[in-house]
């Protein structure tokens, strides 16, 4: 809107900068135990996992970035049992990572997006 | 604290996912009204910027990922008052960039992170 | 299994430094942070503070601050506390401990006795 | 700093029998995120400390089930079951919710 008004090399790296913070997946850090919900008696090694999810801005205040498909990575980790009555086992855990991301006008309701084999 | 039990490969594998996510400065998208506090008529565009932030995990579930150290970026943004009495105005907001993280035990009260010219 | 050996028992005088170790093993060494405890004869538990051994970071007691410094050698899996400007009350046994990520101290090395006296 | 007061300092008690302490901090244990991070530590005479209970009810690896820990907020509780001789020694609760973590002055637990 105010391309007579400045130069076109600002302008240019405004849009970039837009681009960039658009509503994608993005490298983020899940705590497992938190996306399983809560149990008192069950750990996981390591308790984070990097995964792709939805981020970023959407054009519009109303819309929220949100997933439109999704993959599911295994991650191997060590499932501990309290009290610990035996090895920590190594188990798949599937994880959800985001591959589609759109601007939608409402949240549905999040489903839980770990898997347990 | 399995090592005797697994392949080597596998725990090198585990291991590097947990380096991954461990706290460290990421880039992250913020909304740039929402940082300097609510206004209703002034708004930016691009409403989102760029910027690194703490994120990750901790080695501990007490410790929070927060930032010890910042510099400011300036983000040249068009600032528009509402209702729409003038052009645009091209403003350099300077944005917080975090430069370095730490896990520390409680979380402080969060300043703003933007600094306004 | 999981193992903190700890360097053997020292002597020292008042005002000197001494430095202790605490070699780990059977587990990911800078998945966890590593705890410094004392303990005088007869006495209770007393934290001194940790380092989180995958970047250095420290978070000492105040009590201990400007006399205490963790570090660790990754090359290695052995973390180091050394402690300055000794005195008479500084004699205890000074132990290692593993925290585990939900808390508590899971592993404890058998501790370095330190006897400070002139 | 969060003080941690233990009760009783001494417990004689008999083969058998049940045995409880008390652990008091100063100051609420309930994190920010929830959690409480209360935990019971054991030592033995000679030997180094070990955890027996963290975040106020999870048994550590190994430990028997006679021993159990309750509470919430500011006030705890160790429980054994039936003491065997092996329990005598000095029992310790910590916490680490806040910094510097704190323990308690320890509670000796001694056959009658």
């Known amino acids: 809107f105010a391309a007579t008004f400045y130069d076109i090399e600002t302008l240019k790296v405004i849009d970039e900068e837009w681009q960039r913070t658009q509503c994608s997946p993005r490298e983020t850090c899940v705590e497992v135990a938190s996306e399983l919900g809560k149990s008192t008696n069950t750990f996981f090694k390591p308790p984070c996992v990097n995964v792709f999810r939805c981020g970023g801005c959407c054009n519009e205040e109303s819309l929220i970035c949100m997933n439109t498909s999704t993959s599911y990575i295994s991650k191997q980790l060590f499932e501990i049992s309290v009290p610990l009555t035996s090895v920590p086992e190594l188990v798949p855990v599937k994880v959800a990572n985001h591959t589609g991301c759109k601007c939608l006008p409402t949240a549905p309701r999040h489903p839980y997006s770990i898997i347990r084999r | 604290f399995a090592a005797t039990f697994y392949d080597i490969e596998t725990l090198k594998v585990i291991d590097e996912e947990w380096q991954r996510t461990q706290c460290s400065p990421r880039e992250t998208c913020v909304e740039v009204a929402s940082e300097l506090g609510k206004s209703t008529n002034t708004f930016f565009k691009p409403p989102c910027v760029n910027v690194f932030r703490c994120g990750g995990c901790c080695n501990e579930e007490s410790l929070i990922c927060m930032n010890t150290s910042t510099s400011y970026i300036s983000k040249q943004l068009f600032e528009i008052s509402v209702p729409l009495t003038s052009v645009p105005e091209l403003v350099p907001v300077k944005v917080a960039n975090h430069t370095g993280c730490k896990c520390l035990p409680t979380a402080p009260r969060h300043p703003y992170s933007i600094i306004r010219r | 299994q999981v193992q903190l050996a700890q360097s053997g028992a020292k002597v020292k005088q008042p005002g000197a430094s001494v430095k202790a170790s605490c070699k780990a093993s059977?587990?990911?060494?800078?998945?966890?942070?590593m705890y410094w405890v004392r303990q005088a004869p007869g006495q209770g538990l007393e934290w001194m503070g940790y380092i989180d051994p995958y970047n250095g970071d420290t978070t000492y007691n105040q009590k201990f601050k400007g006399r205490v410094t963790m570090t660790t050698d990754t090359s290695t899996s052995t973390a180091y506390m050394e402690l300055r400007s000794l005195r008479s009350d500084d004699t205890a046994v000074y132990y290692c401990?593993?925290?585990?990520?939900?808390?508590?101290?899971?592993?404890w090395g058998r501790g370095t006795l330190v006897t400070v006296a002139s | 700093d969060i003080v941690m007061t233990q009760t009783p300092l001494s417990s004689p008690v008999t083969l058998g029998q049940p045995a409880s302490i008390s652990c008091r901090s100063s100051q609420s244990l309930v994190h920010s995120n929830g959690n409480t991070y209360l935990h019971w530590l054991q030592q033995r005479p000679g030997q180094p400390p070990r955890l027996l209970i963290y975040k106020v009810s999870n048994r550590s690896s190994g430990v028997p089930d006679r021993f159990s820990g309750s509470g919430a907020g500011t006030d705890f509780t160790l429980k054994i079951s039936r003491v065997e001789a092996e329990d005598v020694g000095v029992y310790y609760c910590?916490?680490?919710?806040?910094?510097?973590?704190?323990f308690g002055q320890g509670t000796k637990l001694e056959i009658k």
């Open positions: 910590s916490q680490s919710t806040h910094v510097p973590r704190t």
């Open positions: 401990a593993r925290t585990s990520y939900y808390g508590g101290m899971d592993y």
């Open positions: 059977g587990y990911t060494f800078t998945g966890y942070n």
